[in-house]
């Protein structure tokens, strides 16, 4: 991967990732330097007859660093702070080849919840105000609300009117997704509106 266009690599929080390294064909490699955000990460001297010398120069990531037989970088137990720019410099007798990567750490979505702030009008129409959330949502999470295959909202919030006299039972489903996972949570309009109706009659008495 040339230094002009970094290879963008997705990693999942807590899991492992490999940054693949391609060797110049037929050339003897003198040494390989791996950098993270322009700071030295590891220095590797390959040997033809014995194991390579690997000098890990970044103690923070050191214990989680590994290298494949082709000196690709493996990083385990990924943390959010591993996000950033990685570079590998392969030095041969005649040249230096640079490979660049951008590592992006994504969270597996967890713990989807729906909160409900609904109200009942005197004509018995129920207005649902639903809000969907997931743990540690960031800008890469897409939310949408669906019913019967139609998208009713492209945001965490859904406002919709439901009239039990003319509407059949209806489920509303929140779908949260990012590049590595998706979650969904369904709620019943009938159930939510019945709960509101009970509260409404309780306060009237």
């Amino acid at each position: 991967q040339s230094s002009l266009t970094p290879l963008m690599v997705n990693g999942i929080l807590g899991e492992s990732v490999t940054l693949p390294l391609e060797f110049p064909a037929g050339e003897k490699v003198n040494f390989i330097t791996w950098l993270f955000n322009e700071t030295s990460l590891a220095f590797i001297v390959p040997h033809e007859t014995k194991s390579p010398e690997i000098h890990v120069t970044n103690p923070k990531q050191g214990k989680r660093l590994n290298f494949t037989q082709s000196y690709s970088l493996q990083l385990s137990n990924l943390k959010m702070e591993d996000t950033g720019s990685y570079r590998a410099q392969i030095s041969t007798k005649t040249s230096a080849k640079l490979s660049s990567y951008t590592l992006r750490i994504l969270r597996q979505l967890r713990n989807i919840q729906v909160t409900n702030h609904s109200q009942l009008f005197q004509n018995m129409t129920c207005e649902l105000h639903l809000t969907c959330s997931v743990e540690d949502a960031d800008d890469n999470v897409s939310f949408r609300w669906e019913a019967l295959g139609n998208t009713l909202s492209s945001q965490p919030n859904l406002t919709v009117s439901w009239d039990p006299r003319i509407s059949s039972e209806q489920d509303y489903t929140c779908i949260a997704e990012n590049a590595v996972s998706n979650l969904s949570f369904s709620v019943s309009a009938q159930k939510l509106c019945e709960d509101v109706k009970i509260q409404y009659t309780d306060t009237k008495m």
Epitope: S142, R144, T151, S153, S154, Q155, N157, E177
Partner: antibody, heavy 118, light 106 residues
């Protein structure tokens, strides 16, 4: 039917400000995010960011942080794009586009041409 | 940000021919959307979530792909298909568009 109608073309001098409107009709405005997309003359499409039409919270792409402001008037189902300290390179067609989910822009405004020239 | 590279930049074909255009992402994405734009007009939604045709799009259009490589194919070009086609990813912010492929009459 569902549509987004944008305000008319604007000719402005460098340093001035402009406010582009995007009026939505035919759907529940607060249920769908509104995106803004820029297209410079003869160029491709550039996503500027979006605004959550329920909460009013804007999100800007890095290149559009600072001089660009997204806002709403929910009472008239309208989204706005304001650009301050206009530069010649802001000359472009600006589109509003509804997000149908997964940032798929299913309805687009007709575009507003902003020309910045001294 | 995820960079989308569309190729070729221009496709010069005759009506009735098959058109295939590519969109390559700098990182794996979950799905790709496609838009059609004609001169002086706003973009129109064309294909969403990789392979689903937008309302009113003829069946001669199809979309496919996964990971970093996505394709839009027109099985037999009609005069109204000559336009610019843009791909767009949603997996990562900022939502980025490709540079476009112009399908022009040969």
């Amino acid at each position: 039917q569902i549509q987004l109608v944008q305000s008319g073309s604007e000719l402005k001098k460098p340093g001035a400000s402009v406010k582009v409107s995007c009026k939505a009709s035919g759907y529940t405005f607060t249920n769908y995010g509104m995106n803004w997309v820029r297209q410079a003359p003869g160029q491709g499409l550039e996503w500027m960011g979006w605004i959550n039409t329920y909460s009013g919270e804007p999100r800007y792409a890095d290149d559009f942080k600072g001089r660009f402001v997204f806002s709403l008037d929910k009472s008239v189902s309208t989204a706005y794009l304001q650009i301050s300290s206009l530069k010649a390179e802001d000359t472009a067609v600006y589109y509003c586009a509804r997000d149908y989910g997964r940032w798929y822009f299913d309805v687009w405004g007709q575009g507003t041409t902003v020309t910045v020239s001294s | 940000q995820i960079v989308l590279s569309q190729s070729p930049a221009t496709l010069s074909l005759s009506p009735g021919e098959r058109a295939t255009m590519s969109c390559r992402a700098s990182s794996s994405v979950s799905h790709m959307h496609w838009y059609q734009q004609k001169p002086g007009q706003a973009p129109r939604p064309w294909i969403y979530a990789t392979s689903n045709l937008a309302s009113g799009v003829p069946a001669r259009f199809s979309g496919s792909g996964s990971g970093t490589d996505y394709t839009l194919t027109i099985s037999s070009l009609e005069p109204e298909d000559f336009a610019v086609y843009y791909c767009q990813q949603w997996s990562s912010t900022p939502r980025t568009f490709g540079g476009g492929t112009k399908v022009e009459i040969k």
